[in-house]
């Protein structure tokens, strides 16, 4: 069966029907359907006016305008808001009411496209394998990235989040039109990796998507990841404005000037330094989502009530931090180079800047504890990788899972750890699953380009596609049309269980207590350390070109929700990856060609992008009680500095960095909290209280009715910021 021309809100579209084998199965493929009008720089996306006749949707459209790998020219186009659809078809009737999976690509909010890199004439994000193996519809799309997608003045002049709004437009288009392609508009699953995983998370939290999303999967990135929210957007807007010759003294004039500046110039005005960095790479990525009071109405930690009815899977790769650690400390991948205590201490101190000397020292001590017993270079290098994995991915993901679980009504929560090792031959043997290594398996590359892979890779890919598509169908990764290797139990705050995904999976793949000591360290010990003053905490920016100016620490609150503590050691689920990763060739000596790049260009991986290194605080305890968020409204972003001098100061962090005292027993009583004017608020129990969603504050497109003053809205202070 085949669809032929399909009528959409824009007009008729015609794709290609690709036959699969001799049994009569096929897949209808539509590439390049516009879901919004050609963009205007630094403005919200607008509906597409439509067309007459039948649009031939047979080729991918250009990606959104972005810098090339060398960052000295651009590629892509401003007219880029297009989507692609894969619809599996059986022999007889055209498909109806299929689950829909919408992919959001990663790339540090800086690069990427809906089709991904081309390798062996197969695009990374080609949805065919998922669609046909899982019997689901797959949709991918482009959204604006870099300054054009995320530049913001932190106020109404340039509110930012244009790329997130593009994503929402695509999701809403799918909701309105996918029935005509045979999809079920009431069963839409978002999935994405790294910045895409964080985007998935943010879309579930935004009130704009109320009623649009049924399920979501975040791979190596969540809204709470420390690189996701820019708390000082004006600093970065001014950097670009200065580069392109716009005035920076008055935000309104600056905004008007930026809007009429050549978009290519805006794109090239921002460069991420990739070598000789004075600070960890994440400090240099500035154009990411912001809390705009509308699309993202408050700090994401305060918005989990909005995702209460959305089934959720989140996870990480076991060495997600490897690629970033190797940029921050190149010795990691070099057998002849050593990592010293001094090197690691410097790195740690850069991530823990708001906690000053004590923060650096205690963190260093916790992470180097094993070095006395095992001073080998392998152990030291693994420690560096583990440190960045924890901070950038693992701990934030665990908190996101705990928050989802705590606020969920009917929704289910699942956690995973992807551990199938990287196949990059230039990496040391000890390297596990690097950032973005999971993508190729989710998209079925071992089947699509088999020469690059081994049978064990196909085993991993088959399992992931089965779990992912079963989840899209039913909300339970174990139930659906596809057999799975072992039962994946839901995540609960009592068990913090996670599925470890490897080439051999069985009952022992369900695990608990992942890196408990480190999780507990970040959520309790580190958090309780006093915050240092602005003067002590302000990093000295690198000299030379302004591209290398670090993002100053920008968090507005050191306090994070402190969940029950007990000693169960609930394991966090690590976050997953950002697709900026380099190509992943096979190991082994088969001579097989390398596995395709997992990012979307040959670009070196651009790291996560937020404004601070600190992970939020996940639950650690065995009390069984879900983490109980405080109710204060500390989610508001700090007012960014307005002067043009030097690096912006570290924003104030409140009078008390002390976290609320977590419950210690299983009484279910809310924890006692400080009563002064610290940033911790009294903590009411949340559970299934049915907190209303947090709405946008403007007269936004599809905002739910705002909660009344006496709503029991669950709120938390901002995630820890280093």
């Amino acid at each position: 069966a085949k669809l032929g021309a399909v009528y959409t809100e824009g007009g008729f579209v015609e794709g290609v029907n690709k036959k699969l084998g001799l049994l009569g199965d096929s897949v209808d493929i539509f590439k390049g359907i516009p879901f919004a009008a050609p963009t205007k720089a630094l403005e919200n996306p607008q509906p597409h006016p439509g067309w007459q006749g039948t649009l031939k949707a047979k080729n991918f459209k250009k990606r959104c305008l972005q810098a090339t790998i060398t960052q000295d020219s651009t590629y892509g186009d401003e007219d880029c808001l297009y989507l692609n659809i894969w619809v599996p078809q059986g022999r007889k009737q055209v498909s109806r009411d299929l689950p829909v999976m919408i992919w959001i690509y990663g790339g540090a909010f800086l690069m990427g496209s809906g089709h991904g890199a081309n390798f062996l004439n197969n695009y990374l994000y080609d949805g065919e394998e998922i669609a046909t193996r899982g019997n689901v519809i797959v949709v991918t799309f482009n959204y604006r990235v870099g300054p054009l997608g995320f530049l913001s003045t932190g106020d109404a002049n340039l509110p930012g989040n244009y790329g997130l709004r593009d994503q929402h437009m695509a999701i809403a288009w799918v909701k309105r039109n996918i029935a005509a392609f045979g999809g079920d508009p009431n069963n839409i699953t978002l999935f994405g990796e790294s910045a895409g995983g964080a985007s998935v998370s943010l879309q579930t939290l935004s009130p704009y998507n109320k009623g649009l999303i049924r399920r979501a999967i975040s791979q190596s990135g969540v809204a709470l990841s420390p690189w996701v929210i820019q708390k000082n957007p004006l600093f970065w807007a001014k950097k670009v404005a200065e580069k392109v010759g716009c005035p920076v003294g008055d935000a309104a004039r600056m905004a008007q000037c930026l809007k009429v500046t050549d978009p290519r110039a805006l794109t090239l005005a921002y460069k991420v330094p990739l070598a000789g960095l004075e600070y960890p790479m994440l400090h240099y990525v500035g154009f990411v989502p912001v809390i705009d009071g509308d699309f993202i109405p408050a700090d994401p930690i305060n918005l989990y009530a909005n995702a209460a009815d959305i089934d959720y899977i989140a996870g990480t790769n076991n060495m997600d931090g490897h690629i970033f650690a190797s940029i921050d400390m190149p010795a990691i991948n070099k057998g002849n180079k050593k990592v010293t205590e001094e090197d690691f201490y410097k790195l740690v101190s850069e991530f823990t800047i708001t906690k000053g000397l004590r923060g650096a020292k205690t963190t260093f001590d916790v992470y180097t504890e094993s070095w006395a017993q095992d001073p080998s270079q392998e152990n030291k290098k693994k420690t560096v990788v583990d440190f960045e994995t924890d901070v950038l991915f693992l701990v934030p993901t665990e908190i996101a899972l705990a928050q989802h679980r705590a606020n969920a009504k009917s929704a289910k929560t699942y956690a995973y750890l992807f551990s199938h090792p990287s196949r990059m031959p230039v990496y040391p043997k000890w390297v596990g699953a690097d950032h973005a290594d999971d993508i190729q398996y989710v998209f079925g590359k071992p089947f699509a380009t088999p020469t690059g892979y081994r049978p064990q890779d196909r085993t991993v890919s088959k399992a992931m596609i089965a779990y992912w598509t079963n989840f899209a169908k039913t909300g339970d990764p174990n139930m659906g049309d596809s057999a799975v290797p072992t039962h994946w139990e839901p995540y609960t705050t009592e068990n913090s269980g996670y599925l470890e995904i490897t080439k051999k999976m069985g009952s022992s793949s369900m695990k608990r207590s992942l890196r408990t000591n480190f999780l507990r360290y970040w959520t309790l010990t580190y958090l309780a350390l006093p915050t240092v003053t602005d003067q002590e905490a302000t990093p000295v920016p690198p000299t030379g070109d302004s591209e290398a100016t670090p993002v100053p620490p920008t968090g507005d609150s050191e306090t994070a929700p402190v969940p029950p503590t007990g000693d169960s050691g609930a394991p966090p689920v690590p976050p997953t990856g950002d697709s900026g990763a380099p190509p992943v060739p096979p190991t082994g000596d088969s001579g097989a060609p390398p596995v395709p790049p997992t990012g979307d260009s040959g670009a070196p991986p651009v790291p996560p992008t937020g404004d601070s290194g600190a992970p939020p605080v996940p639950p650690t305890g065995d009390s069984g009680a879900p983490p109980v968020p405080p109710t204060g409204d500390s989610g508001a972003p700090p007012v960014p500095p307005t002067g043009d001098a030097g690096p912006p100061p570290v924003p104030p962090t409140g009078d008390s960095g002390a976290p609320p005292v977590p419950p210690t027993g299983d009484s279910g009583a809310p924890p006692v909290t400080p009563t002064g004017d610290s940033e911790t608020a009294p903590v009411p129990p949340t559970g299934d209280s049915g907190a209303p969603p947090v709405p946008p504050t403007g007269d936004s497109e599809a905002a739910p009715v705002p909660p009344t003053d006496d709503s029991k809205e669950a709120q938390m202070p901002a995630v820890i910021r280093f």
């Epitope: 008729f12 007459q52 039948t54």
Partner: antibody
Framework: QVQLVQSGAEVKKPGASVKVSCKAS????????MHWVRQAPGQGLEWIGV????????SYAQKFKGRVTMTRDTSTSTVYMELSSLRSEDTAVYYC????????????WGQGTLVTVSS | DIQMTQSPSSLSASVGDRVTITCRAS?????LNWYQQKPGKAPKLLIY???KLASGVPSRFSGSGSGTDFTLTISSLQPEDFATYYC????????FGQGTKLEIK
């Protein structure tokens, strides 16, 4: 100027079929989609489906799938809407309507054809 | 299908009055159109893309809104404006509101 002229009223028995025509003039016939909308007595408007006169592509509302067929004759700039297995609740005025521009609203309408289904 | 809820279903007003009719979409939509229909006649396009006036339509008619909530406003009613008004969304399966009958008070 754009004109859409529909065929005359029809009276049909339950179970029969009806074929309503809509002749277009004043513009390039193959350049704009043609929709069919009906209105039962005293009721609101209900979209039936759409045809692209250029290539004959069609899309029908779920409710009418299997019972409706839209065709076109480019030589006479006419589109047709055939509805089969008629029942009394199909009694309505049937309108053809052309897109205004792009895939925009229904900017030009025929005068309507009353189809009465009665035993 | 996308649901379109129009309110009020009927409305009495006098010549010279300012009148507002609302239409709510669930879920949100891209574009909304408004039509006027007089008894025994075909509908006539008034407003398209939420706020754009179709050619030949008097400027006393205006439209606004986005996403889920839309309004049609007639700033100063004229005798010829008494009719039934419909909102309409275009998705892959277009739908109309149930109509608002505007009568003389």
């Amino acid at each position: 100027q754009v004109q859409l002229v529909q065929s005359g009223a029809e009276v049909k028995k339950p179970g029969a079929s009806v074929k309503v025509s809509c002749k277009a003039s004043g513009y390039t016939f193959t350049s704009y989609n043609m929709h069919w909308v009906r209105q039962a007595p005293g009721q609101g408007l209900e979209w039936i489906g759409v045809i692209n006169p250029g290539d004959g592509a069609t899309s029908y509302a779920q409710k009418f799938k299997g019972r409706v067929t839209m065709t076109r004759d480019t030589s006479t700039s006419t589109v047709y809407m055939e509805l089969s297995s008629l029942r009394s609740e199909d009694t309505a005025v049937y309108y053809c309507a052309r897109d205004y521009y792009g895939s925009s609203p229904l900017g030009y309408w025929g005068q309507g054809t009353l189809v009465t289904v009665s035993s | 299908d996308i649901q379109m809820t129009q309110s009020p279903s009927s409305l009495s007003a006098s010549v010279g009055d300012r009148v507002t009719i609302t239409c709510r979409a669930s879920p949100s939509i891209s574009y909304l159109n408004w039509y006027q229909q007089k008894p025994g006649k075909a509908p006539k396009l008034l407003i398209y893309a939420a706020s754009k006036l179709a050619s030949g339509v008097p400027s006393r008619f205006s439209g606004s809104g986005s996403g889920t909530d839309f309004t049609l406003t007639i700033s100063s009613l004229q005798p010829e404006d008494f009719a039934t008004y419909y909102c309409h969304q275009r998705s892959s399966s277009p739908t109309f509101g149930q109509g608002t009958k505007l009568e003389i008070k």
